[in-house]
Every structure is written in C-alpha cells, then in structure tokens.
C-alpha cells in the first residue's frame, strides 16, 4: 500500500513513546487520582473541557478522574505531535486518500459540511453534490411525512422498514432510538440479520398498503440485505395482487448501483446515493440516514449534521492541549499501551442511548481492530480496545461489579444529559439517575480502604471482600440535553477519538479486510448445504458441525 502520510513504521519508534514508558514506570503506575486532587486544587478546572455546539448548547468532558498529571498530558501531546496526528487529520479534511489500502479518501466529514465550504476530492468540490443529496432527502422525507406521498391504494405511509446491515443498520437504529423523543409521524423498523426471524417478525406488524421499505446497500449486492429485500418484495407482491408496478410507491434504495436497483423494480428517482469516500461505519450522515430524516424530520436531521460539523470545527481548529477528541484518544492510548488495559466501557446514563455502545463498538473495533501499520509491518503493541457498554443504571446491576472490584483496569466513559426529555414525578427519576452517574465515577476513583470497611463494622475474612481499590479511571461526559445536535456532536467526538488512536498506532482505521474471509467461506459452505451429501472438505470440526446440522435441519 502507498503511504505518504506518516514517516514512521511503528509507534514504539517514537521518542515520546519511550518517554511515556519511563513516566509510566516512575509515576504512572503508582499515580493516585485521589492524591492528585489533594495536591492540585485546580485539577478539575484544568482537566475539564466544555464544548459549545453550533446552537449554543454545551457538553462538558471531565477528564480529571483519569490517571494523568500535567507531565503525562504533556508527554501524550508530544506523542501526538511526533505521530503527526494533525497532519493526518488535515489530510483527511483535505480529501486526500488516507485510506491507503483501498486508495480512497475518507470524507464522511464532508457529509456534514453545512457551511457549504468547498471540500475537494480528486480535484472535485463535492460540497454541491452533498448538498444535492440532502435536498433530495429533504424533499422525499417531507413528502412522506406530510402524507403527500401515498401508497398504491392512496393511503399515507405509516411505517418505514430499513433493510440493511452493519453501517447501513447500526447508525440509523442507534440514532432513531436516541432521538425517539423527536419522532411522532412515522414508525420505523430495522431488519438486519439474515436470520429469517428478523424479517418475519417485522412483516407481522406492518401493513403493505402503508409501509415504505428502504433497501440500504451501497453496492446492492450485500448478501444478507438483498436476501431480506427479496423476501420483503415477495411478501409485498403476495399481499398486493402480484402487481410489480406497486413497488415504486413502497420501495426506495440507499445505494449507488443503479442497474441492480432498477432490476429490483425500484424507480431510480427514489435512489439515494453516496460516494466511495463514505465508509459504512461513517455513513449515518449520508443517504443511509434517510430513515432518520423520515423518523425525526429533515430539520432535526440537519441539526444532527450540524452538531457533528461543530465537533469537526473544534477538532480541526483547537490547539492540542484543549482539543477534546484528541485528548480522549490520547487517554485511550495511555491506558491501552502503558497500563495494558484491553477494554473501554461506555455507559450512557440514558435509556434513549441504549444502542450507543453497540454503535461505538463497530466504530471503534472495526476501525482499529488492526495489527498491521501503514508501514506494512505488524505492530509490536496493542491496538483496538474491546469496547462494550450498556445503559446505566442497568449496568450497575450486571458488569459494574467487575469494573469496581475485578482484576482488570477498565477505563470508562459515563454519559448523562442534565435535562431529561421525561422529567416525570417532579424529576425524581432524573435525580436518581444523576446521583448514580456522579456516585459511580466517584466510587471508582476513591474506592474504600480496609479502615473504612472495618469502621463500618466488618470483621475478619469479610474485610477484604468489601475493600474497593479505587483509582479506576472514568471520563464523565455531561450534556445539557440529548438533542439531535448533541447526539451528532457525541458521535463525531468518538469518531475523532477513534481517528486519534489509529493515527498514533499508525494503522489504517478506514478499511475492514477482517470481514472478508468469513464471507468467502460462507459462500462455499452455502452451496454445500444445498445437497444431502456428507461433507468432508473441511477440518473435522467444521465437517462434523455441518453434517450434524444437515441431519437435524
């Protein structure tokens, strides 16, 4: 692969890496956050950063409970400079082909360029094209939501079914759930899994006369999506007198393969496309977000884009010391590579954000789950945290036990909106939620020593069981309210955190070769499942499983 963006092969070659190694040994591994607060009355002041969104709303990022001090932060920033994170960032924002293994630009940031400033890829200003897609989405979503767009019997659309997988599903699912408060006109459903149950259960609850299907597949060849789409089409035709002319009113495509879209029976006027510089896991900002625009309305969708654009502006214009996503990424590297942390917990204290960790899981793990650098050599360091999470307070009653008292260091992000969309019972629920948000981060930091445990009456062998070591790092993210703009900003924050990690590890965060092998083998095995012969072409385990399956199927 051609890589002209970085001049180092491995992050371990960088002087700041060795410096951080020494700092970790001399102070990092014994650093006590509790003591750091005692030493420095201005620690919170210095280590919290407030992001102001385009609409004036704010998000506070509190990094002060992390295992860092001034010297560590300075060394991490030095590492970012040596790794030329800003150079790679600027190359991305200039539309250069930073996805070196696929020789593509990485330009999802151009999708939220609502300032309409010129943004170039290969000499083409793509801003007018992006704007044109959004105009098409606006017109279409407003027609459907207003009832002007009618189904084949003249009834207005009541339900939208998005059929897609991976980036064509996770983003829209997460965002529609997160912004449910802004919906009201349409119901939206998502079908992703090839398991027939997913489409079957969805088709049970929708009416063919009032349902619009969105087939989301860039190439219109994704096996799972096209299989589900054909099942939906066959169901639709079987319920509507087998008249293919009705398809045009009930199916739209989020794709770039005009030929296949037309072959399927979809009117190409109802085809919403995006360019090759949009990666799947970065595509919710594109036409793939049509289900979002239909659900919450185009104006809210645009606010979502503008929230992300505001973070883009912050990321590109803010000095490193105050650059919020950059600091988030640097902390991740600090824990991953110097503390040996292998996971990253994201716990939203917000039920609307219940799919946010799943979305971030793809964003982070598909981007940075790589072991070869841009210099085409295997890394000699850990990359790609295992990201997981569930909404709190539920999570407190499941895996938080391990976070508090387990043997692993689990850097955690806690997310809360100060204002609830549902301030019921005189805000009782919200206050309880918030008290847990604050308490969990505090408890993880301060812990509980043997003295306190004994003072509380515990004796003998029970004492060590009740001890909390504390000093477990958290970043608290406090938003004013989960609005479309806030959500856009939060996603963009994590995109740029992921970018920063990948830039320092010198990996290509924008390909996904790891998804290919399984797909190829599944095609081979798929053919073997079509006949009744005993299979012996694989290893003994795979043969045994296939043959047992065929016997039982």
């Amino acid at each position: 692969s051609n890589n002209s963006f970085t001049n180092f092969k491995l992050a371990t070659e960088l002087p700041a890496w060795s410096k951080l190694q020494k700092i970790y040994e001399s102070q990092g591994k014994t650093l006590s956050v509790k003591q750091e607060f005692q030493k420095d009355a201005k620690r919170f002041e210095k280590l919290n950063k407030t992001f102001t969104n385009y609409d004036g709303s704010k998000i506070l990022f509190d990094y002060s409970k992390n295992l860092v001090n001034d010297e560590i932060i300075a060394a991490l920033i030095e590492l970012a400079k040596e790794a030329n994170v800003t150079g790679l960032r600027d190359a991305m924002f200039k539309g250069e082909h930073i996805n070196s293994t696929e020789d593509r630009a990485v330009y999802h940031v151009a999708l939220r360029n609502r300032a309409n400033k010129p943004m170039y890829v290969d000499g083409v200003n793509v801003a007018p094209e992006v704007d044109s897609v959004l105009k098409h989405m606006k017109e279409f979503s407003e027609q459907v939501r207003s009832g002007e767009w009618k189904g084949y019997t003249g009834k207005k659309i009541t339900d939208v079914v998005n059929i897609g997988i991976g980036g064509s599903d996770l983003g829209p699912v997460m965002v529609t759930e997160a912004l449910k408060h802004y919906a009201g006109v349409l119901d939206v459903h998502f079908v992703s899994n090839i398991d027939g149950t997913h489409i079957a259960e969805t088709l049970k609850v929708v009416d063919p006369e009032t349902t619009l299907f969105l087939i989301a597949s860039k190439t219109f060849t994704t096996a799972e999506t096209i299989t589900n789409a054909n099942t939906a089409k066959n169901w639709f035709l079987s319920k509507t007198g087998n008249d293919p002319s009705h398809i045009a009113k009930h199916f739209a495509a989020l794709s770039t393969n005009e030929t296949e879209v037309a072959k399927f029976g979809i009117d190409t006027k109802n085809m919403f496309g995006f360019e090759s510089w949009v990666g799947g896991r970065y595509s919710v900002w594109s036409a793939i977000g049509l289900s979002v625009a239909l659900y919450i309305g185009y104006d809210n969708f645009e606010a979502f884009l503008k929230g992300a654009e505001a973070v883009d502006n912050h990321f590109t214009q803010t000095p490193l010391e105050d650059n919020i996503p950059l600091l988030g990424g640097l902390l991740s590297v600090w824990y991953n590579n110097f503390f040996g942390a292998q996971t990253h917990l994201v716990a939203p204290f917000d039920q609307y954000l219940h799919r946010f960790p799943a979305y971030l899981q793809q964003l982070s793990m598909e981007s940075n789950g790589k072991s070869v650098t841009r210099g085409n050599v295997f890394t000699d360091y850990s990359t790609g945290s295992i990201l997981f999470g569930e909404p709190a307070t539920n999570a407190q009653h499941s895996f938080f036990q391990l976070v508090h008292q387990g043997t692993k260091l689990i850097p955690s992000d806690f997310i809360l909106a100060a204002q609830s969309h549902n301030p019921i019972e005189n805000k009782l629920h919200q206050k309880m939620l918030a008290s847990n948000f604050f308490a969990q981060a505090e408890a993880l930091m301060v812990g509980k020593d043997e003295e306190q445990v004994k003072a509380e009456g515990a004796t003998g062998g029970l004492v060590p069981h009740k001890v909390f070591s504390g000093n477990r790092p958290t970043t608290s993210i406090l938003a004013q309210k989960i609005t479309p703009a806030t959500l856009g900003a939060l996603i963009a924050y994590y995109e740029h955190v992921t970018f920063t990690e990948g830039a320092i590890w010198n990996i290509n965060s924008f390909d996904q070769w790891g998804v290919e092998l399984g797909k190829v083998l599944a095609k081979v095995i798929g053919k073997e499942l079509d006949n009744s012969s005993t299979i012996s072409t694989h290893d003994a385990s795979t043969n045994g499983l296939i043959n047992q399956f065929k016997e039982w199927m």
């Epitope: 098409h136 037309a262 190409t268």
Partner: nanobody
C-alpha cells in the same frame, strides 16, 4: 469549478457522420447521468440521448438507430456518435450532466452542428 466542454461539431453533408465529445471537470463524473440536448433555431431545446451512471441509454425517437451515446468514466468523457445525418439534425448540441442522487445539473456552452450540402 465545473466545466462541460463540447467539441466535434461542424459542417457535414447529409448522410455523413460526426462524433461529438464532452469533457467534464469538477464533478464526480461516474455519479452523473450524462446527456446530449439540441436546440434548432426557433425551437425548444430537446433531449437527444442520455446515459445513466449505470450505463443505461435512452434516445429521442428521431435519432434512434442513428446516434449512439457512450461514456468513458476513466477520462470523464461522454461521446455522441451521429450517423446518417440529415438537415433536421442541424442545431446547437449541448452537453448536460445530472447528478444521480439529487437535483444538481450542469450545462455546456454548446457546439454547432450544421447538416447541409
């Protein structure tokens, strides 16, 4: 900035052939449907031929079988091969690009085709 530059027009005798070219720059060419329109003096501009981003073609009834539209995505070019020309084909021929995913279009300046003996 966006440019569509037509070439290949000129004077040709009835029954003759011409090949028009349109060089596009400043657009994501492969994502555009490209077309040729023409306008004869005192008449409305009319579609002659169109090729979608996927390569499907459409022709005006009056030119079907005589004209062929093609595209070269690697070089951002669209062609109109015109055979068996007659005086009815005399017009200014305009190159047109229509973005496949939204309401965005561009026009060239036009090239004159005159069929006369």
């Amino acid at each position: 900035q966006v440019q569509l530059v037509e070439s290949g027009g000129g004077l040709v005798q009835p029954g003759g052939s011409l090949r028009l070219s349109c060089a596009a720059s400043g657009i994501t060419f492969s994502s555009y449907a490209m077309g040729w329109y023409r306008q004869a003096p005192g008449k409305e501009r009319e579609l002659v031929a169109r090729i979608t981003s996927g390569g499907s073609t459409d022709y005006a009834v009056s030119v079907k079988g005589r004209f062929t539209i093609s595209r070269d995505n690697a070089n951002n070019l669209v062609y109109l091969q015109m055979n068996s020309l007659n005086s009815e084909d005399t017009a200014v021929y305009y190159c047109h690009s229509q973005y496949s995913y939204g309401p965005l279009e561009y026009w060239g300046q036009g090239t004159q085709v005159t069929v006369s003996s």
